[in-house]
């Protein structure tokens, strides 16, 4: 099939990095500067992406592959192929329509991007808070309160009655 195709269409012989030039009797011409063709048999070369402004070049354009961009410092990539750049915030903040805002009490963000997330609720797993959470860090859950009582063993004797609201000494 390949041979048949190449007999019928001389353009199919043109490799990546070239295009089939109709103006020159369908011979394979190299892609002009600042353009590329990533597959063979192309009748035109595509214009290279320019990484300007908020973008900066991560990989230069070649005759066979497009340039790849990332974002200028202070921004991070969003979307396929880094189609947009979004402003970084500090840890402990999230980006809103009005800019970077501190995480509300009870939430945290340990990255420069993304949203503030609620602290882990240790009690849901029957555990206690070992280290308190901050705007930048989640809480650290420790063993359950029962595991921390002095002389705890696999068979725990009944604890003496305590007034409600009083924590164990």
């Amino acid at each position: 099939f390949e041979r048949t195709r190449s007999l019928q269409d001389p353009c199919s012989n043109c490799p990546a990095g070239t295009f089939c030039d109709n103006n020159r009797n369908q011979i394979c011409s190299p892609c002009p500067p600042n353009s590329f063709s990533s597959a063979g048999g192309q009748r035109t070369c595509d214009i290279c992406r320019q990484c300007k402004g908020v973008f900066r070049t991560r990989k230069e354009c070649s005759s066979t592959s497009n340039a790849e961009c990332d974002c200028t410092p202070g921004f991070h990539c969003l979307g396929a192929g880094c189609s947009m750049c979004e402003q970084d915030c500090k840890q402990g903040q999230e980006l809103t329509k009005k800019g970077c805002k501190d995480c509300c009490f009870g939430t945290f963000n340990d990255q420069k991007r993304g949203i503030c997330r609620p602290w882990t609720n240790c009690s849901l797993d029957g555990k206690s808070v070992l280290v308190n959470g901050t705007k930048e860090r989640d809480v650290v859950c420790g063993p359950s309160p029962a595991d921390l009582s002095p002389g705890a063993s696999s068979v725990t004797p009944p604890a003496p009655a305590r007034e409600p609201g009083h924590s164990p000494q």
Epitope: G53, V54, F55, S83, M84, Q87, L95, G99
Partner: nanobody, 117 residues
């Protein structure tokens, strides 16, 4: 393919004026907030001004407030930046961007503005 092409830059004396234009294609211009940013030699990117899709909401950086005016013509798919009372510290490459000051995309080469006597 989204295309943004800036023009109108040049060399101007302090106190002078320039009007930058940005021709947009490849997307529905009237649906998008548009933004001007600039980059001075050896410096990071600085936000200058943004205008909402319909042109009703406009914000400026403190450094250009009262001197620069952003506008748009949705019928012509063009964004503008009128710059008056230019100062040497306004010297930079100016880029127009699709999006807000916090989330944007640029594709043009920019236009050089040099303020010098």
């Amino acid at each position: 393919q989204v295309q943004l092409q800036e023009s109108g830059g040049g060399l101007v004396q302090p106190g002078g004026s320039l009007r930058l234009s940005c021709a947009a294609s490849g997307f529905t211009f009237s649906d998008h907030t548009m933004t001007w940013v600039r980059q001075a030699p050896g410096k990071g990117l600085e936000w200058v001004s943004s205008i909402s899709s319909g042109g009703s909401r406009i914000i400026y950086a403190d450094s250009v407030k009262g001197r620069f005016t952003i506008s748009r013509d949705n019928a012509k798919n063009t964004l503008y930046l009128q710059m008056n009372n230019l100062r040497p510290e306004d010297t930079a490459v100016y880029f127009c961007a699709r999006g807000t000051r916090y989330k944007m995309s640029t594709s043009g080469p920019g236009t050089q503005v040099t303020v010098s006597s």
